[in-house]
Interface confidence: low
């Protein structure tokens, strides 16, 4: 072995200590304050101003190059002179109730202009009027329950659903498929109000007038709806609005639980099918359609006047050039645009990125460059469908697929203050486990213990005893294009709540006007110790990926994951044993490919132990095999009906964009298969998907073999 390896490692670990030591909670707090003074809605002056500020500060911090990267994308805004609302009208057509036009501003923010009122971005305009049907969370299974078991039709009705469990775009898609002509989304106290906690500003719960904004697109990874697959630059061909990708076809509007109470209190029709359909309001949660008794002549009317507009957005892209491998890119990115103040989403993440940039910049000013190039990104228009990151990746896809080592996402740093939460590719499992063992836990009762210790105790893995849980990547954030489309190894980390005792969906004030700096400082992280820990985790991931001589990827963890996913999908399929037999469905080929991958991965790791790291060519060969392994799971044809989801092992669930599904092609082919009219055709598609998965795993294994 080369004699200088030990000193190389000392300098690596010394440099990492220096990098981590430079990260300061006080700075993150200052940055968060600075980033939350005004709203930063995508496409607005304020958000462009913040982009410029970040651009200039990253330059000051010492990055080699910082650029604003702009695109002209389709965004959606409420009409300032014609506000959106929902009303109850009597038989004469008179409005007897109207929902709020805006949220009450939080204390200290009364004079801030440009607070966008709650709306569902990309809702079409319309004034549908009709009877209401309550559809629970509007999940696929909720509509199955309504239509198949309760025999209630949503056709021509306005549906009302409570936020939670799944991405709101999936809720709208399901309502459209059920024939609804409008949709109302609301936050139920059961999902957004934790018992014994006060409402904001006295606590972190959602007040009755608080409303969750959000987009209701079904983009499936397309990026800008008018330029799918290509960057939305000045040369771009733009589809007509009628051919735009993923736009909802029915008006949609969000409300708070005070307004929802008025809409739900006189609902008629059958009682909720079971307790899982009952929320926390003092209403019967009758399903409808329509109001009961004396109220049966009343209707609900939606008044939606939002509009779409091609608008310029700005990413900030910072480059710290690698000293030895400048053509290998490690990317740290998080979004900058917010629905309003963005106290948690995204600025708790943006502030952490800012401090990480500052620390890397400090090292660079002392002459300590990373081995590989690090790209830092402040994405725009994430809230409008991951547009900034997707357009940038579309523009630079050829470079990224050749040079992209890893992407670390950096949206909200906190969604609670209980323990760490990590979602990543199996390639990064070991990296995350190892680096958390070197970091101090910020948790009470774990003084002097490692982050790994508190994490594994509070969030144990369901499969591996004595290890913490790491989840699959889904979507709903800016890693999507890098992982699901381009096959770049990706990961994300943040602090989360105790999911066992706290049943609320997300955090209560998510996407409301009450998501402020004060919310974080008073209730979530007064000392910013959790923010600092997240900065250390994200920063250490980037540091190791950019500086380790051998890329810190573990292909054997992928082998273990593949075996688990193959077992899972096989068990789903075996719920239909007769059909499996009748249509000759076998998973043998997939299990064989997984076994082969396991064997090849083991041998690769053996060769890696014996690698002469002083030989730059041999080192580059094996690093490239590691870097390109994630790429090997990409199918250029994409998944059925979802061409921009191209990863064969993982995709966002077709029923919930936020959740990750393993072997998604097979999973979707099997989903609800027993109700398919043409069983032969359906099972044939299962067979086809098994063959695609088999080929992909086998082909990926081949990339790990000795090159010659």
């Amino acid at each position: 072995k080369p004699s200088n390896e030990a000193t190389g490692n000392v300098s690596h670990s010394g440099m990492k200590k220096e990098f981590l030591h430079e990260l300061k909670a006080e700075n993150i707090k200052k940055f968060l304050y600075n980033f939350t003074r005004t709203p930063h809605l995508a496409g607005t002056q304020n958000n462009f101003e913040l982009a410029k500020q970040i651009h200039d500060q990253w330059k000051e911090f010492g990055l080699d190059l910082v650029e604003l990267s702009h695109y002209d994308v389709l965004l959606s805004y409420p009409n300032k002179t014609h506000p959106n609302y929902i009303s109850i009208i009597n038989e004469d057509g008179n409005e007897i109730f109207k929902t709020s036009l805006s949220e009450q501003p939080p204390p200290g923010y009364e004079n801030i202009s440009d607070v966008v009122p709650p709306y569902s971005a990309f809702s079409p305009q319309g004034t549908p009027e009709g009877d209401l049907v309550y559809v629970n969370y509007a999940r696929t299974e909720d509509f199955f329950k309504l239509e198949r078991e309760m025999k209630i039709s949503c056709s021509g009705k306005i549906v009302i659903a409570r936020y939670g469990k799944v991405f709101r775009g999936n809720m709208v898609k399901n309502a459209q498929l059920a024939g609804a002509k409008g949709m109302i989304l609301y936050s139920d106290p059961a999902d957004y109000f934790v018992p014994a906690v006060k409402s904001y500003p006295d606590g972190w719960n959602l007040p009755g007038g608080g409303v969750q904004r959000g987009n209701v697109l079904n983009l499936n990874g397309a990026g800008d709806p008018l330029t799918p697959g290509y960057p939305a630059n000045e040369h771009a061909y733009r589809h007509e609005l009628t051919n735009a990708v993923g736009l909802p076809s029915i008006p949609v509007h969000p409300i708070g639980y005070d307004d929802a109470q008025k809409l739900l209190e006189h609902m008629g029709g059958p009682a909720p099918p079971d307790s899982s359909w009952k929320g926390g309001l003092k209403v019967p949660y009758n399903v409808g359609p329509g109001f009961a008794g004396n109220f049966s002549t009343q209707k609900v009317k939606m008044h939606i006047h939002s509009y779409t507009k091609v608008t310029r957005i700005y990413n900030v892209i910072g480059t710290l050039k690698g000293a030895l491998e400048p053509d290998r890119y490690v990317i740290l990115g998080g979004h900058r645009d917010a629905w309003v103040f963005g106290g948690i989403d995204p600025q708790s993440g943006a502030a952490v990125v800012h401090e990480i940039v500052r620390s890397f910049g400090t090292l660079k000013k002392k002459g300590r460059r990373p081995r590989r190039t690090i790209l830092f990104a402040s994405w725009d228009a994430e809230e409008f469908g991951l547009l900034g990151s997707t357009e940038w990746a579309e523009e630079h896809s050829r470079l990224l697929q050749e040079r992209g080592v890893a992407y670390i996402n950096a949206d909200s740093s906190i969604e609670g203050n209980y323990t760490l939460r990590v979602d990543c590719t199996p390639l990064m499992y070991s990296l995350v486990y190892n680096l958390t063992k070197e970091l101090q836990s910020p948790d009470e009762g774990f003084e002097g213990k490692s982050l790994y210790d508190s994490w594994k105790e509070k969030s144990p893995s369901p499969e591996f005893i004595g290890m913490p849980r790491i989840s699959k990547l889904g979507s709903g954030n800016d890693f999507e294009v890098f992982f699901q489309r381009l096959g770049i190894a990706s990961g994300r980390a943040r602090y989360t709540k105790n999911w066992k005792t706290n049943k609320v969906s997300s955090y209560p004030l998510y996407h409301s006007v009450y998501e402020t700096y004060e919310l974080v400082v008073k209730f979530y992280d007064p000392t910013f110790k959790y923010h600092l820990t997240v900065a250390q985790v994200r920063g250490a991931m980037v540091f190791e990926l950019a500086n380790s001589i051998v890329l810190p990827f573990d292909c054997q963890s992928y082998a273990v994951a593949l075996k688990k996913y193959a077992d899972t999908i096989y068990n789903i399929s075996m719920k239909h044993p007769q059909e499996m037999k009748a249509y000759m469905i076998s998973f043998d080929s997939l299990f064989s490919a997984v076994n082969n991958f396991t064997d090849v991965a083991s041998k690769f790791n053996q060769r890696l132990q014996e690698l002469d790291k002083s030989n730059p060519i041999l080192l580059r060969i094996m690093n490239d095999q590691l870097m390109y392994l994630e790429r090997a799971f990409i199918d250029p044809l994409g998944l059925p009906g979802r061409p921009f989801y191209r990863h064969i092992i993982y995709a966002p669930s077709s029923h919930n964009k936020y959740a990750g599904e393993s072997f998604p092609g097979i999973y979707d082919a099997l989903f609800d298969i027993s109700s398919k009219v043409n069983a032969s055709k359906a099972w044939n598609e299962v067979k086809r998907q098994i063959s695609i998965a088999t080929f992909t795993v086998q082909a990926a294994a081949e990339t790990l073999r000795e090159v010659a």
Partner: antibody, heavy 123, light 108 residues
Framework: QVQLQESGPGLVKPSETLSLTCTVS??????????WGWIRQTPGRGLEWIGT???????YYSPSLKRRLTLNMDTSKQEFTLRLTSVTAADSAVYYC???????????????WGHGTQVTVSS | DVVMTQSPATLSLSPGERATLSCTVS??????LAWYQQKPGQAPRLLIY???TRATGIPARFSGSGSGTEFTLTISSLQSEDSAVYYC??????????FGGGTKLEIK
């Protein structure tokens, strides 16, 4: 070299609409990537930013004027215009058209100014 | 809006002396600050941007310093043609972009 020249009526009646044009020579709006704006100056209020425009049509207005203000750009004529409705004596000022510093620098400092044109609002 | 306060309102100095003009901002503007010179009957002219960077063609005797809320324009050795009104302007927080009220510099 790039030059800016304001033109428009020197006298406008109260409650009427003030229209000013700035003609740009020596630079193309669309290829230069600069932001273009208007500033006015009175002895009492000093220098006051009115608004700024980019060739894509993006407009940035002063909050105190935005209800009455419209900025437009004609890239073929290399002109951008200011329309201020319902004027009062308080709108009497020297109006300058300006260019913001540096391509794509956004709402930055003003590195190029027209000579200015005096507008008086009076009946 | 960000309030810009310039001091002194008037400054009267002799040729060759050093002039120090001050601009105080009501909230931090980082280094997003510019200085302009305006002579009677003329449009303002950009002297300094980014708090300390001289614009093209500006003599070296003009220098800017400061960051956050306190900024200074220094003219190291006054010449008679430096008689003018000097304005500061911030471009960190907008809308609106705001200017100071000006300092009138007279050369005796």
């Amino acid at each position: 070299q790039v030059q800016l020249q304001e033109s428009g009526p020197g006298l406008v009646k109260p409650s009427e609409t003030l229209s000013l044009t700035c003609t740009v020579s020596g630079a193309s709006f669309s290829s230069s990537g600069y932001y273009w704006g208007w500033i006015r100056q009175t002895p009492g209020r000093g220098l006051e930013w009115i608004g700024t425009m980019f060739y894509t049509g993006a407009t940035y207005y002063s909050p105190s004027l935005k209800r009455r203000l419209t900025l437009n750009m004609d890239t073929s004529k290399q002109e951008f215009t200011l329309r201020l409705t319902s004027v009062t004596a308080a709108d009497s000022a020297v109006y300058y058209c300006v260019r913001h510093r540096g391509p794509d620098s956004g709402l930055d400092a003003f590195d190029l100014w027209g000579h200015g044109t005096q507008v008086t609002v009076s009946s | 809006d960000v309030v810009m306060t310039q001091s002194p309102a008037t400054l009267s100095l002799s040729p060759g002396e050093r002039a120090t003009l001050s601009c105080t901002v009501s909230q931090s503007v980082s280094s997003y600050l510019a200085w302009y010179q305006q002579k009677p009957g003329q449009a303002p002219r950009l002297l300094i941007y980014g708090a300390s960077t001289r614009a093209t063609g500006i003599p070296a005797r003009f220098s800017g310093s400061g960051s956050g809320t306190e900024f200074t324009l220094t003219i190291s050795s006054l010449q008679s043609e430096d008689s003018a009104v000097y304005y500061c302007q911030q471009y960190n927080h907008w809308p609106p972009l705001t200017f100071g009220g000006g300092t009138k510099l007279e050369i005796k």
